[in-house]
């Protein structure tokens, strides 16, 4: 059963390592894949002394942990590299860190990426 499924056809693309990887730095990435597979968008970033540094954004292959996620939200507490994925066109344009620990109440820290 699939409820309210959101098709992903394109995602915001960013690659901080674009020169070494020989890719564009930023743009819109069309998401390709087998027709029976779902597609997602993702974002990865680091928090260096309170400053957000985006590592990569783009399309993400079919991954059940990305199903039913309309917003790109990292919920893990204090990861080394932040990661989120979502379903829906350009859903990785905005991403946020919303740590959820089992005991304490979560607090939201929305991040709007501004690739330099």
């Amino acid at each position: 059963a699939i409820l309210g499924r959101s098709e992903t056809q394109e995602c915001l693309f960013f690659n901080a390592n674009w020169e070494k990887d020989r890719t564009n730095q930023t743009g819109v990435e069309p998401c390709y894949g087998d027709k029976d597979k779902r597609r997602h968008c993702f974002a990865t970033w680091k928090n260096i002394s309170g400053s957000i540094e985006i590592v990569k954004q783009g399309c993400w292959l079919d991954d059940i942990n990305c199903y039913d996620r309309t917003d790109c939200v990292e919920k893990k507490d204090s990861p080394e590299v932040y990661f989120c994925c979502c379903e829906g066109n350009m859903c990785n344009e905005k991403f946020s860190y919303f740590p959820e620990m089992e005991v304490t109440q979560p607090t939201s820290n929305p991040v709007t990426p501004k690739p330099v």
């Epitope: 059963a1 699939i2 409820l3 309210g4 499924r5 894949g33 087998d34 029976d36 597979k37 779902r38 292959l61 079919d62 991954d63 059940i64 942990n65 990305c66 199903y67 039913d68 996620r69 919920k75 893990k76 990661f83 994925c85 959820e100 620990m101 089992e102």
Partner: antibody, heavy 118, light 111 residues
């Protein structure tokens, strides 16, 4: 420490029902997809069912479709498998498994034995 | 119906190297199937060894490595030890919420 504790297994007659539970702790349950995997005596592992983070998407192997229902209660940190119209070939140890990004099973429970026999 | 195939059994000498493979009947295995490998000893729950083709799970020794060899996923054990004697399962994520396990390989460490 991540822990997954299955319960609810036992002996049941063919055509009967059982409800398995998997109590999760040590991680934020509502952030991860979950799955059930079974192993018949002396046989290999077989994927049975999976469920997305919200419970909005559920999936089954062909042999249990229409008989088994997977669900989750994120407020109770518990995964369920409702098994109806049980058959002898459903006899197995049932494991619950946490699913991590890249869709792999990163933690497993110790399993609960379901025996379907008259 | 997708069938994932593994060698039913394999043997290796202590200190030797063995490569177990995982293929399927519908084409080539690629990284998009997120191949993962699990070790199981009798009476125990499976243990995660390799995920996402070639990433070792936490605490897994670097004797275990994963790769794509030709059109199959592969698990290589170098410097095999007696306690590597186990059943090994590969799993492919077919997408859209569906996983398929291989039939498993029973590894015997000789001697």
């Amino acid at each position: 420490e991540v822990q997954l504790l299955e319960s609810g297994g036992g002996l049941v007659q063919p055509g009967g029902s059982l409800r398995l539970s998997c109590a999760a702790s040590g991680f934020t349950f509502r952030n991860y997809a979950m799955s059930w995997v079974r192993q018949a005596p002396g046989k290999g592992l077989e994927w049975v069912s999976g469920i997305s983070v919200t419970g909005g998407s559920t999936y089954y192997t062909d042999s249990v479709k229409g008989r088994f229902t997977v669900s989750r209660d994120n407020s109770r940190n518990t995964l369920y498998l409702q098994m109806n119209s049980l058959r002898a070939e459903d006899t197995a140890v049932y494991y619950c498994a946490k699913v991590y990004y890249s869709s792999f099973f990163d933690y497993w429970g110790q399993g609960t034995l379901v025996t379907v026999s008259s | 119906q997708t069938v994932v195939t593994q060698e039913p059994s394999f043997s290796v000498s202590p200190g030797g190297t063995v490569t177990l493979t995982c293929g399927f009947n519908s084409g080539s295995v690629s990284t998009s199937y997120y191949p993962s490998w699990y070790q199981q000893t009798p009476g125990q729950a499976p243990r995660t060894l390799i995920y996402n083709t070639n990433t070792r799970s936490s605490g897994v020794p670097d004797r275990f490595s994963g790769s794509i060899l030709g059109n199959k996923a592969a698990l290589t054990i170098t410097g095999a030890q007696a306690d590597d004697e186990s059943d090994y399962y590969c799993v492919l994520y077919m997408g859209s919420g569906i996983w398929v396990f291989g039939g498993g390989t029973k590894l015997t460490v000789l001697g």
